[in-house]
């Protein structure tokens, strides 16, 4: 349970100013005889809270005029060190005749509640009961800085007190500190630094990895002009006042570079025509990528050694590398660019397309009948290797009969050696159509445009075959 | 400054399990591939695994199984789980950054190529 | 697996010397160059020197040079310093597989 016990009380008012490390105990005379009767503080049980006075109750009234109520003048100003404790009070005579009067502290317009050591001493007298109201901070900081107030409810009047005003004192305090920034080789700067007491002024010095850079301080704030850097720096601000020095943060000021190359690539995948790749990207030169390049050329020693380049957005950091040769092997690059220039190339790395299936038909292709042997005989050309799209493994025959009111297609598989074939006159008196596609592993490709020849009855002979030209012999 | 700093080593049982840590700083573990690498004792360099940008992890064939690579990456930290350890194991044992790597994803393998910055080294010894 | 070999194991050279230490192997390099060399010294880890077989890496003196393709490659050093003693490794890549092979090691000693 906690004990309050009295202050000594100075005589008269105390006005003016009071500048101390220590705590200034601030009261009431004590010559007019008042004993001290009661006392609480706000964590006692049962009690009102901070500031809150209950006037014992007076039975009886005198009728002569009262005299107006104020609280008396105290110390208005004190200032003091951060982390010190201070206490200071206001105190009021009230007749006996008032009941139940409430004082509350009040800080820049606001209430002050709760947590805050509030104590209220009564000295009670045969007509009147002097109160004094202390308020103490123990380890003071910059936010209690602020004019101080107590007020009285009486009869619904309200008795306002002189303001005390505090003010804390210490190093300075920064509101605004130097930031990084990636910059351009030999391009102005600017830094900020700002700085607060009290006490004021404060100057500000600059400091450039290590060493001073202006001999002269600076009222706060201040802006450095950095001309220009070749090379990264380090940057701080020293904020000085009467109480000392405090120093800012340091700040690295980079300079923007090329960006390294990318240090990872993937290959996610491949068919005939494409390759989709990754990368991840490598360090950036302090400057946002902007686009990436993607260099691709044939591994063959025997192409022309010819590039294909890709320009893409630097995000996903995805591409797929379309247009490309079936079955082929190709080298690979990524390069990334920032607003300062490309990086250089990854090392080149290897990725094949797979087999496709072939981009055209066969070519040339010739029909006729060989009715001897009461067949159809079928030749043709091999696509150009280049739109083969892989290693063929042979042709498909696509082979329509139609006569009257009958038509039956069939299918036939013929190897990848040679390049005719010969199939069974399935119908006589009718038309016999032709297609033929090439295949690899990849697939089936188009079949050719389709070639007719006329099957005769039995006995009549037409030699003349039936053919697709060759691209350029039309 | 970029650096590696190797830890976790010292003597162990035969039979036994150790985890390894490679810390990193001044360059981030999600932006490059890592790897191991080990020294017996006297002897030659022997690789033993990496880890992608990515997390995908490639071991040589005679780590497989036993040996394990994996990261943490918001501690910026790789480690390796070394299980059955044999005397054999016995070496002072490295991790380096891939200076730059190449990913075959759909072939599950990836190429090194080159080591471009080293730790110290921490020593595994293995014996009873 | 593929296999990388250094000769000679072991080299006696005096300062000034031009050195020359080869590393073959049995099978293609990746690319056909992604071949590199680290300088290795007693209770110190490796040090890349040269990457793409003929790259030097960053801060490596230019004494150090090296070439090759394929499956035979070389590493020189044109006149050999105080410094360079040491044991030198070639490592290297292969396609269709992940393994990261390293050479047996080449020690320059002082004659």
């Known amino acids: 349970r906690e004990e309050a016990k009295p202050y000594p009380l100075f005589p008269g008012p105390f006005p003016g100013s009071l500048q101390t490390d220590h705590t200034p105990l601030l009261s009431l005379p004590h010559a007019s005889g008042y004993q001290p009767a009661l006392m609480f503080s706000p964590t006692q049980p049962g009690r009102p809270h901070t500031g809150n006075v209950a006037i014992p109750q007076v039975t009886s009234v005198e009728s002569k005029p009262l005299p107006p109520l104020a609280f008396k003048h105290t110390v208005g100003h004190i200032i003091l060190s951060e982390h010190k404790g201070v206490k200071f009070n206001c105190s009021i005579s009230v007749p006996n005749i008032y009941q139940d009067t409430t004082i509350s502290w009040w800080k820049d317009g606001k209430e002050l509640l709760g947590a805050h050591h509030a104590i209220t001493q009564f000295y009670p007298d045969d007509e009147v009961t002097a109160i004094i109201a202390s308020f103490s901070i123990t380890s003071v900081q910059r936010s209690d800085n602020g004019s101080y107030i107590c007020k009285m409810k009486i009869n619904n009047e309200e008795i306002v007190s002189d303001p005390i005003y505090i003010e804390v004192q210490g190093l300075p305090h920064f509101t605004k500190q130097p930031e990084s920034m990636n910059v351009t080789r030999n391009t102005a700067f600017n830094l900020t630094c700002q700085a607060v007491g009290p006490p004021e002024p404060v100057n500000i010095f600059w400091v450039q990895n290590s060493s001073r850079v202006n001999e002269q301080p600076e009222k706060s704030p201040s802006v450095l002009t950095v001309p220009g850097l070749t090379e990264m720096a380090v940057f701080s601000c020293e904020a000085h006042n009467d109480k000392g020095l405090t120093v800012s943060k340091g700040v690295q000021i980079n300079i923007k570079a090329i960006p390294s190359p990318p240090t990872e690539v993937s290959i996610r995948n491949s068919t005939a025509h494409s390759i989709l790749i990754s990368w991840v990207p490598g360090f950036d030169g302090y400057s946002p990528f902007r686009n990436c390049s993607i260099q691709v050329k044939e591994a063959d020693p025997l192409s022309n050694g010819s590039v294909m380049i890709f320009n893409t957005s630097a995000l996903p950091h995805l591409y797929q590398i379309k247009q490309l040769q079936a079955l082929a092997n190709y080298s690979i690059g990524v390069s990334c660019m920032n607003e300062i220039g490309w990086s250089a190339v990854s090392p080149w790395i290897l990725a094949s397309t797979t087999e496709g299936a072939p981009s055209v038909a066969p070519l040339n292709v010739t029909v006729f009948l060989n009715e001897s042997s009461d067949n159809v005989d079928i030749r043709w050309m091999k696509p150009p290797t280049k739109q083969q799209d892989g290693e063929l493994v042979g042709y498909r025959i696509s082979h329509v009969w139609q006569s009257a009111g009958i038509s039956k297609e069939l299918l036939e598989e013929v190897g990848q050696n040679g390049s005719r074939a010969r199939i069974s006159v399935q119908v006589h008196n009718a038309t016999c159509t032709v297609r033929i596609a090439a295949v690899t592993r990849g697939g089936v490709g188009p079949f050719s445009d389709p070639v007719k020849i006329f099957i005769p009855a039995h006995g009549w002979v037409d030699y003349a075959p039936s053919s697709t030209p060759a691209p350029g012999n039309a | 400054e970029q650096q590696l700093v190797e830890s976790g080593g010292g003597l162990i049982q035969p039979g036994g399990s150790l985890r390894l840590s490679c810390a990193v700083s001044?360059?981030?573990?999600?932006?490059?591939?890592m790897s191991w690498v080990r020294q017996a004792p006297g002897k030659g360099l022997e690789w033993i695994g990496i880890?992608?940008?990515?997390?995908?992890?490639y071991s040589a064939s005679w780590a497989k199984g036993r040996f394990t690579i994996s990261r943490d990456s918001s501690k910026n930290t790789m480690y390796l789980q070394m299980n059955s350890l044999r005397a054999e194991d016995t070496a002072v044992y490295f991790c380096?950054?891939?200076?730059?790597?190449?990913?075959?994803?759909?072939?599950?393998?990836?190429?090194?190529?080159?080591?471009?910055?080293w730790g110290q080294g921490t020593l595994v010894t293995v014996s009873s | 697996d593929a296999q990388l070999t250094q000769s000679p194991s072991t080299l006696s050279a005096s300062v000034g010397d031009r050195v020359t230490i080869t590393c073959q192997s049995s099978?293609?390099?990746?690319?056909?160059?992604?071949l590199s060399w680290y300088q290795q010294k007693p209770g110190k880890p490796p040090k890349l020197l040269i990457y793409?077989?003929?790259d030097l890496a960053s801060g490596v003196p230019s004494r150090f040079s090296g070439s090759g393709s394929g499956t035979e490659f070389t590493l020189t050093i044109s006149s050999l310093q105080p410094d360079d003693f040491a044991t030198y490794y070639c490592?290297?890549?292969?396609?269709?597989?992940?393994?990261?092979?390293f050479g047996g090691g080449t020690k320059v000693e002082i004659k």
């Open positions: 099978k293609s390099i990746y690319n056909n160059n992604w």
């Open positions: 490592a290297g890549g292969y396609s269709g597989d992940s393994d990261y092979a």
């Open positions: 001044g360059f981030s573990l999600s932006s490059n591939a």
């Open positions: 793409d077989a003929s």
């Open positions: 380096a950054r891939v200076g730059f790597f190449v990913g075959y994803g759909a072939y599950d393998y990836g190429i090194i190529h080159r080591l471009d910055l």
């Open positions: 880890i992608s940008s990515s997390g995908s992890t």
